[in-house]
């Protein structure tokens, strides 16, 4: 039968715990991202600002992941208006504060 | 590692039936969409059916609407093809895929494919 | 019912630059994946999201989409890029896959 959405978004979930648990040298290479207001933007906002990061096979399959949550298409800076105060953080902060609201999400119910 | 195996296919009459299986191991099936994408000797790529993951939505091409029915038994991590009124054109290789993650799993990319499994519809 | 189309064949020298076009009706609003096939072989995914690489694919390939067109690169064509190139995308609820180019690497 059907299965509910959340089983995805634990996918993702622990995709984001095995990137920081596997952590050893800087996550792509010390890479900068847009910090952005993921309560505001969510999932596609989230690609947006990942979608910069190239040649970083550690979050490539985060990146697939979250396009999966985002019914259009994404390019780099689509969501520029989203971006905190035109902050840029560290791919590995990113991603910690990306897990922490996926988290939130879960526990919530809030699936979509 | 992500494994796919197809089976199920052979030689059938032209309107008949045949079920094609595909067993998967190495991934956390129930939670990603899945496809079965065909190959007719000596053509292109013509994707057939899809079954997402996270709402239990299905997807058919126009060639095979009402004719092929897509399933899935999540206990078992294996996806179905049931195949009915089967014609010469149907013949082909027919591969299973593994799909994205969540409603718009379409956006993720076909990485791993099945070796494939031959149908031939014949008389 | 959306269709992508690829010029049937491309002819490239080793070392030298081989291109491939997908075309279809506004194609650049969509995700574009490209897939290498070789004879008896499954079908391997070399770009999603229409210019990314998965793991293992080597840099020679690159793909860009804008408009109605797709394009995948590979640079310094070797002899083990011979094969077939399929475009591919996602329009009203179905995959679309393109016509198919065989590439041949010629000497």
């Known amino acids: 039968g059907p299965v509910p959405p959340s089983t995805a978004l634990r996918e993702l979930i622990e995709e984001l715990v095995n990137i920081t648990q596997n952590q050893k040298a800087p996550l792509c290479n010390g890479s900068m991202v847009w910090s952005i207001n993921l309560t505001a933007g969510g999932f596609c906002v989230a690609l947006d600002s990942l979608t910069n990061v190239s040649g970083c096979s550690a979050i490539e399959k985060t990146q697939r992941m979250l396009s999966g949550f985002c019914p259009h298409k994404v390019s780099a800076g689509q969501f520029s208006s989203l971006h905190v105060r035109d902050t840029k953080i560290e791919v590995a902060q990113f991603v910690k504060d990306l897990l922490l609201h996926l988290k939130k999400l879960f526990r919530e119910g809030q699936f979509n | 590692e992500v494994q796919l195996l197809e089976s199920g296919g052979g030689l059938v009459q032209p309107g008949g039936s045949l079920r094609l299986s595909c067993a998967a191991s190495?991934?956390?099936?129930?939670?990603?969409?899945m496809s079965w994408v065909r190959q007719a000797p000596g053509k292109g790529l013509e994707w057939v059916s899809a079954f997402s993951g996270s709402g239990g939505s299905t997807y058919y091409a126009d060639s095979v609407k009402g004719r092929f029915t897509i399933s899935r038994d999540n206990s078992k991590n294996t996806l179905y093809l049931q195949m009915n009124s089967l014609r010469a054109e149907d013949t082909a290789v027919y591969y299973c895929?593994?799909?994205?993650?969540?409603?718009?799993?379409?956006?993720?990319?076909?990485?791993?494919w099945g070796q494939g499994t031959t149908v031939t519809v014949s008389s | 019912s959306y269709e992508l189309t690829q010029p049937p064949s491309v002819s490239v020298s080793p070392g030298q630059t081989a291109s491939i076009t997908c075309s279809g009706d506004k194609l650049g609003d969509k995700y574009t994946c490209w897939f290498q096939q070789k004879p008896g072989q499954s079908p391997v995914l070399v770009i999603y999201h229409d210019s990314k690489r998965p793991s293992g694919i080597p840099e020679r390939f690159s793909g860009s989409n804008s408009g109605d067109t797709a394009t995948l690169t590979i640079s310094g064509t070797q002899a083990m890029d011979e094969a077939d190139y399929y475009c591919q995308a996602w329009d009203s609820s179905t995959y679309v896959f393109g016509t198919g180019t065989k590439v041949t690497v010629l000497g």
């Open positions: 190495g991934f956390t099936f129930s939670s990603y969409a």
């Open positions: 895929v593994q799909d994205g993650l969540g409603p718009y799993f379409y956006n993720y990319g076909m990485d791993v």
